[in-house]
């Protein structure tokens, strides 16, 4: 069982100075995705603290993927901290906020939200249930937090996390100020299994964020949500890696056994924007 290949590595206060990330996705592992193309891309490595090259398969993957070394550095390295902190007051939205609404190719139509760049607000749209693009949010709040301008001119952010004391699961938490370290897996990994609207009975896997494991479920063949994987391995790769299991000074972070253990201290800091 590939889940057993994972272990908890304690994050201690020793050996390395605090790691401070500009964006949550900078903490994601390089993800080549399931496709077979060979594309040179860059990702930020939280262990070496540098932007490094990797080969991308051409589809899926995650946001820790950049066309150029410069773009990676701009988004993820501390050299740019001051510049980014300053520009947070008029911070650019993520690129995907400017994408057109995209219903995708499926026909299990559900209500989702997208940022409408013409009206400068989040609006509902008809989503087919698969594919499409990242300008696609399950809730109005998530869309607003990521793509709409906050009341003080900076982006309100929704990548912060808090530990749910009831079930020890991670839940998104809106933060009203930009956060230097925001660690969050793909949002759909937090959604419940959704059979969808059709009548098939396909074997699929979903990530159960309460127990922290990938579990099987029967998929109807259309609709549903993105927490839907054809194999357990794919589910684990997409959702389990990088999820913080307990947030505290000596918090835990999941790592693979095959990786050399590395100790990292993660500093949780927030910039409070003052009147200038």
């Amino acid at each position: 069982d590939s889940e057993e290949d994972e272990e908890h590595t304690i994050i201690t206060d020793t050996e390395l100075p605090p790691l401070k990330l500009m964006h949550s996705f900078c903490a994601f592992k390089a993800d080549d995705g399931p496709c077979k193309a060979i594309m040179k891309r860059f990702f930020f490595n939280i262990f070496t603290r540098q932007c490094e090259e990797f080969i991308y398969g051409g589809c899926e993957g995650n946001q820790n993927r950049f066309e150029s070394l410069e773009e990676c550095k701009k988004m993820c390295t501390r050299d740019n901290a001051n510049r980014i902190i300053k520009t947070t007051l008029q911070q650019e939205k993520p690129d995907f906020c400017f994408l057109e609404e995209d219903p995708g190719i499926c026909r299990g139509y559900i209500t989702r939200y997208f940022y409408n760049n013409q009206t400068k607000q989040c609006e509902r749209f008809k989503y087919g249930g698969c594919l499409g693009n990242m300008n696609n949010f399950e809730t109005l709040e998530e869309c607003k937090n990521i793509c709409e301008d906050g009341p003080n001119g900076f982006q309100v952010d929704n990548y912060g996390t808090q530990l749910n004391a009831v079930n020890n699961s991670l839940t998104p938490q809106s933060t009203k100020v930009p956060s230097l370290f925001e660690f969050h897996g793909p949002s759909w990994c937090l959604t419940p299994a959704d059979r969808g609207l059709c009548r098939a009975n396909e074997n699929r896997f979903y990530y159960n964020s309460v127990i922290g494991k990938c579990r099987p479920f029967k998929y109807s063949g259309c609709g549903g949500n993105e927490n839907n994987f054809t194999s357990k391995q794919e589910c684990l790769r997409a959702c389990k890696k990088g999820f913080i299991q307990r947030i505290s000074k000596g918090g835990l972070i999941k790592t693979k056994r095959k990786r050399k253990k590395q100790r990292v201290k993660i500093a949780y800091e927030e910039i409070f924007v003052k009147n200038m």
Epitope: I110, R124, R195, L197
Partner: antibody
């Protein structure tokens, strides 16, 4: 004051088409969705589709996609619904109703247009 | 499509009594997307409750809504004469948007 004023009653023969209008006032027409909902005599409500006039975004109920056409005239703040190939079961009261861009709270409704299909 | 089934079809009660109207969905619907409308004879429907439990402007506090998943309820704690009408539940979580067939609340 927000108002949706619909056109008058229609009597049509099977196979014909009907075009209903809904004139909006008292709000920014292009900033809201306009829905069309029908109600057959003594029956429930059935959603036909919606149009957002600013960008011409339209969502249809698949059941009506081949027969219903939603349009909007921004200059007159008027929404239209045309239903073709009418049959007796299309006899109903047809309502227009507006909702915001973030939810489907149909907070204002027209008075309804009665369409009777009979040979 | 999601089918909303309302029960009972007709509910006969007297003023002062408690009314419980049910709405059952064929598939799970997020509570944020479940609304209720009131309709009186010869009138257009009126938005009554949004997001399962949020009363629309002007709706008396004797009305309440609850539920999650596939089961939703509209409750009137003590019926007043003006409450007798038809109530429709409505979902917009999935397309096409659908309504229940309605529960007619009539005076006994």
């Amino acid at each position: 004051e927000v108002q949706l004023v619909q056109s008058g009653a229609e009597l049509k023969k099977p196979g014909a088409s009907v075009k209903l209008s809904c004139k909006a006032s008292g709000y920014t027409f292009t900033s809201y969705w306009m829905h069309w909902v029908r109600q057959a005599p003594g029956q429930g409500l059935e959603w036909i589709g919606e149009i957002k006039p600013d960008q011409g975004r339209i969502d249809y109920n698949e059941k009506f996609k081949t027969r219903a056409t939603l349009t909007a005239d921004k200059s007159t703040s008027t929404a239209y619904m045309e239903l073709s190939s009418l049959r007796s079961e299309d006899t109903a009261v047809y309502y227009c109703a507006r909702s915001s861009v973030v939810d489907v709270a149909m907070d204002y409704w027209g008075q309804g247009t009665t369409v009777t299909v009979s040979s | 499509e999601i089918v909303l089934t309302q029960s009972p079809a007709t509910l006969s009660l007297s003023p002062g009594e408690r009314a419980t109207l049910s709405c059952s969905a064929s598939s799970s619907v997020s509570s944020s997307y479940l609304y209720w409308y009131q309709q009186k004879p010869g009138q257009a429907p009126r938005l009554w409750i949004s997001g399962t439990s949020i009363l629309a402007s002007g709706v008396p506090a004797r009305f309440s809504g609850s539920g999650s998943g596939t089961k939703y309820t509209l409750t009137i704690s003590s019926l007043e004469p003006e409450d007798f009408a038809v109530y429709f539940c409505h979902q917009w979580s999935h397309y096409p948007f659908t309504f229940g067939q309605g529960t007619k609340l009539e005076i006994k």
